[in-house]
């Protein structure tokens, strides 16, 4: 268990042209408040999916009236932190939505009117117990500066708030099987704490805060025996004579789901199924529409004309997420062909092509031999983006312009002497060797180990390599 804390530092016009008009005026004074919604993990969740990690609403800020003619300054903020308690482990990765709301205080019929000024969203990694993390997010012409952290509530500690600590009972060391609680070396790890009220006889837990029942027992706290007798209703009658015990209060008792949501029990708690146009853990959040500007980074809002219809953000290339809030590493898709280097410039992708290739994605293989002549009877061979000449005998170099020394590579084996010849090279073999490159030993009895010497050539005679 622990608390996610959000501190809003400022909300005002962002840098650059097109400063927003002040949301308040002398005729229509207003004040701001903020809402934060947290979801676990970095998965792409729909904007209307529940704030499964929790949500919180700030207090109202001071009443603000625009000074005529003045640009919108940083607006006065509510005091204090937004705190979102979490009951289970801190997930380490989370998604957030922070909404800035305006409460208009003019002579509204039926009380104050609320409107959404800005919404920012993002996905972050955060270890519990770490320092405050600072962030700046822009929504249109507005800029929100804030800090956040996750801290564990005693006795929980650790980056996920899953380790439990308690003060040492003995000054020197912890009890059997329990380690010191780094960094709180004066405390010891405690055994798991199950859900409050979990039956010590019939319940157990493998994770902090859960309550799992032994066979024969049921209910959120494992206090209800599983009966074989027939009960009048799934929850059991109030009379004990039928053999069914009245269960303890269930998580859906009193229906925690607002706005007509229906409640269903889950192994750990409850779940609200919300009507269209509402979302949140308890269906407490009314639907977001395209008019609220939920699509970031140039996303186009499709559908969602009214709270009863969900919107979809069509994201520009390079962004994804239900609100186009997540940048995609477009180079990870390896769009550049033929070994081109990928550059994601944000507004566009660029491919830096290897020699011999061209096109936006290096898809065109240039004709390497076009306009390239190989001298002295050489032929041009394309390959790998660079032309190569296959040279006629006796020539070498990139364009076959250099006279080749055929003996430079010392081609004659076993001490044979090399002689350059108009048609190639000639090896004069040392005694006991034969072959074009003097590669074959001559057997002592005069028979060669491999092909016989051509007629008219004795072993040891120079062999011309054609």
């Amino acid at each position: 268990a622990g608390v996610f804390e959000l501190q809003i530092h400022s909300f005002g016009p962002g840098p650059g042209p097109g400063a927003p008009r002040s949301p308040c005026s002398a005729r229509l004074p207003c004040r701001l408040f903020f809402r934060v919604c947290l979801k676990p993990g970095l998965s792409e969740e729909a904007a209307e999916s529940p704030c499964a990690l929790g949500a919180a609403l700030s207090a109202r800020g001071p009443v603000y009236t625009e000074q005529p003619g003045a640009p919108a300054p940083d607006l006065p903020l509510p005091d204090g932190l937004l705190q979102v308690p979490f009951r289970d482990a801190w997930p380490g990765t989370f998604s957030f939505i922070i909404e800035t709301w305006r409460e208009e205080l003019g002579d509204q019929i039926g009380g104050p009117a609320w409107s959404l000024l800005a919404r920012v969203a993002g996905r972050r990694r955060l270890a519990a117990g770490g320092p405050w993390a600072r962030d700046i997010q822009r929504a249109g012409a507005w800029e929100l500066r804030f800090s956040y952290r996750a801290r564990c509530e005693p006795p929980a500690v650790g980056t996920a708030c899953t380790r439990l600590c308690r003060p040492r009972s003995a000054p020197s060391r912890c009890g059997p099987g329990l380690r010191p609680c780094a960094p709180l070396e004066d405390e010891c790890e405690a055994p798991l704490v199950c859900r409050a009220g979990c039956s010590p006889e019939h319940g157990f837990c493998e994770q902090p805060g859960e309550c799992r029942c032994l066979e024969g027992w049921t209910g959120p706290l494992c206090t209800v025996p599983v009966s074989t007798s027939s009960c009048l209703s799934p929850r059991g009658p109030s009379s004990a004579t039928t053999g069914c015990l009245v269960p303890g209060p269930g998580p859906c008792d009193g229906n925690p789901c607002a706005n007509g949501g229906s409640c269903s029990e889950t192994p750990r708690s409850f779940e609200c199924t919300c009507p269209r146009g509402f979302y949140g853990l308890r269906c407490e959040v009314s639907g977001v529409t395209c008019a609220d500007g939920p699509c970031f980074n140039g996303g186009l809002c499709v559908g969602g004309a009214d709270p009863d219809s969900a919107y979809i953000c069509h994201c520009p290339p390079g962004f994804q997420g239900s609100n186009c809030e997540k940048r995609v590493d477009r180079c990870s898709l390896q769009p550049c062909r033929n070994g081109g280097l990928c550059l994601d410039l944000g507004h566009a992708l660029r491919c830096r092509c290897r020699a011999g290739f061209a096109g936006p994605r290096c898809e065109h293989d240039l004709d390497d031999c076009a306009g390239r002549a190989c001298a002295n009877g050489g032929t041009c061979v394309e390959g790998g983006g660079a032309h190569r000449c296959s040279c006629a005998l006796g020539f070498g170099g990139r364009d076959c312009r250099e006279r080749a020394d055929p003996c430079a590579a010392r081609p004659c084996a076993h001490g044979g002497r090399c002689y350059a010849h108009f048609s190639g090279l000639v090896c004069a073999c040392a005694p006991g060797y034969m072959g074009a490159r003097c590669e074959f030993p001559v057997h002592p009895d005069g028979a060669s180990a491999l092909p016989a010497a051509p007629p008219g050539l004795r072993p040891g005679d120079p062999q011309r390599y054609l």
Epitope: G18, C290, C295, G299, L300, H314, P316, P317, P360, R361
Partner: antibody, heavy 118, light 108 residues
Amino acid sequence: QVQLQESGPGLVKPSETLSLSCTVSGDSIRSYYWSWIRQPPGKGLEWIGYIYYSGTTNYKSSLKSRVTISLDTSKKQFSLNLDSVTAADTAVYYCARIGPAGFYFDYWGQGTLVTVSS
Amino acid sequence: EIVLTQSPGTLSLSPGERATLSCRASQSVSRSYLAWYQQKPGQAPRFLIYGASSRATGIPDRFSGSGSGTDFTLTISRLEPEDFAVYYCQQYGTSPITFGQGTRLEIK
């Protein structure tokens, strides 16, 4: 430099299907959304719809029942089909690339006039 | 759908003068997702401004855009002869994408 070129018949009979193609050069067709916009003679611009290589499409609701936009990455082309045309569909039809930072139109074809007449 | 109304319908000015073209939306345009285009007779529109105030590549700095919410402005600081054309605004925050009806900028 990105270039777009519309092609297709300039005259279509009422109740028939208007079919246009747009050939893209100088850019990867997989990297952007591609759109059709039309402009009746002497009037303003009207967005018809767009497509992305992933298959995502979006059409103007008043035309949705009659419009299909498709894309052929191998030919570097995307196409517009508009069914059951009437004289009100007479317009210059433009194909355009949707920009990298939002759904504005940063490159346009030169346009092709399609007249619906018997 | 978001209806964009441009004013004036026609603006008559001389080269060297300053032109101010207005585009008003029937409801707030998300995150200032508004673009401006220039169109000359017989030609395709030319992309000028996106995000209400960001100039497209190659657009001279005499063109500037401003505004947010429902009121947007395109300003041409010193008119050149080639600037006389029809100008359209377009919002791309909410589907359907919509254009204004255009403002004709003509030589006085």
